[in-house]
């Protein structure tokens, strides 16, 4: 096959998908904030977004998109969907994906979620400053 | 089969802006990334910047300050739009595409040769 | 940005022999066991055309006459037998980093 197996992308082309990324995020976050005021951030999720192991960071994809499947069902899917779409690329292809359950009250779903969205859009940013940081 | 064309102005003169289209057939401009490339009278090829499936795009830093690419979907064009041109940007522009992660850019227009002179 | 060092700038091969033509990043473009190297060939007044893809891959419809080889910072083209039809100028071009940056060219002439 042309394309080269998904976790093994140069950093140019994971800066490519992190730039398709950021304005999904982005858009996403600002919709959720618009519609659900007054959300406070869960102090409870947190979303271990970057890998540990790699110089310069990597989006631990694999981490991330169980929260994504998670909360699909209760947000704009259609936008979800091209993130999950994103981040299928950026997968290790035998790193295991963990269940994950959104909470059942819905004052604290909400802040799950929002606390999701903004996590993940922070977390972009991080990557993205280490891409455009190397020697460029 | 893909084809790239690029087309636009063959003169232009200094401060002035250069804008060249690169018509596509065969393939649509929102799958892939879509690329603008010069070569130098002496042969250098440089890379400019892309405009991706979705729009967003991405260019050189050495040319950051002075370049835009865009697109229409309606008619499958992307653009190169580059200003403040001097001597210096004189050069063949071609327009390629990367169809692929971990690929290479496998269509390439047939080139354009843009002179900035007054 | 990462700089491609082509060698030689030029090369005068007899017909049938072999043609060998490198290129050296100033840093290393492999991620996991991939080279993100590639190869073009440009005839005079024509567009590049890929040659190989991801350093040692043959782009589809090019003749089993070209190679690639290499990894990390160091690698090659060869083009064996060489015949009339292969002037041209070749470039490689790295995709690991932004921005894209290609080596300065290769003409090969015919002795």
């Known amino acids: 096959s042309h394309m080269a197996p998904t976790h093994q992308l140069p950093p140019s082309d994971v800066r490519k998908i992190i730039l398709e990324l950021q304005p999904l995020s982005r858009g996403l976050l600002e919709d959720y904030q618009k519609k659900e005021t007054g959300v406070p951030e869960s102090n409870r999720t947190l979303l271990l977004c970057l890998t540990s192991d790699s110089q310069p960071p990597r989006l631990n994809s694999s981490a991330i998109l169980p929260y994504f499947r998670a909360i699909r069902p209760l947000s704009d899917k259609n936008i979800i969907d091209k993130i999950i779409e994103q981040l299928d690329k950026l997968k290790f292809q035998h790193e295991p994906e963990t269940e994950i359950s959104v909470p059942a009250d819905t004052f604290e779903c909400k802040s799950f979620i929002l606390t999701i969205l903004q996590q993940f859009s922070a977390c972009l940013e991080s990557v993205f400053k280490s891409l455009n940081s190397g020697p460029q | 089969e893909v084809q790239l064309v690029e087309s636009g102005p063959s003169l232009v003169k200094p401060g002035g802006s250069l804008r060249l289209t690169c018509s596509v057939t065969g393939d649509s401009i929102t799958s892939g990334y879509w690329n603008w490339i010069r070569k130098f009278p002496g042969n250098k090829l440089e890379y400019m910047g892309y405009?991706?499936?979705?729009?967003?795009?991405d260019y050189n830093p050495s040319l950051k300050s002075r370049i835009t690419i865009s697109r229409d979907t309606s008619k499958n064009q992307y653009y190169l739009q580059l200003n403040s041109v001097t001597t210096e940007d004189t050069a063949t522009y071609y327009c390629a595409r990367y169809g692929n992660y971990g690929y290479a850019m496998d269509y390439w227009g047939q080139g354009t040769l843009v002179t900035v002179s007054s | 940005d990462i700089v491609m060092t082509q060698s030689p700038a030029s090369l005068s091969v007899s017909l049938g022999q072999r043609a060998t033509i490198s290129c050296r990043a100033s840093?290393?473009?492999?991620?996991?066991?991939?080279?993100?190297m590639h190869w073009y060939q440009q005839k005079p007044g024509q567009s590049p055309k890929l040659l190989i893809y991801r350093a040692s891959n043959l782009e589809s419809g090019i003749p089993a006459r070209f190679g690639g080889s290499g990894s990390g910072t160091d690698f090659t083209l060869t083009i064996d037998p060489v015949q009339a039809d292969d002037v041209a100028t070749y470039y490689c071009?790295?995709?690991?980093?932004?921005?894209?940056?290609f080596g300065g060219g290769t003409k090969l002439e015919i002795k």
């Open positions: 840093e290393s473009v492999d991620t996991y066991g991939n080279s993100f």
């Open positions: 071009q790295q995709s690991y980093e932004d921005p894209w940056t």
């Open positions: 405009i991706s499936y979705s729009g967003i795009t």
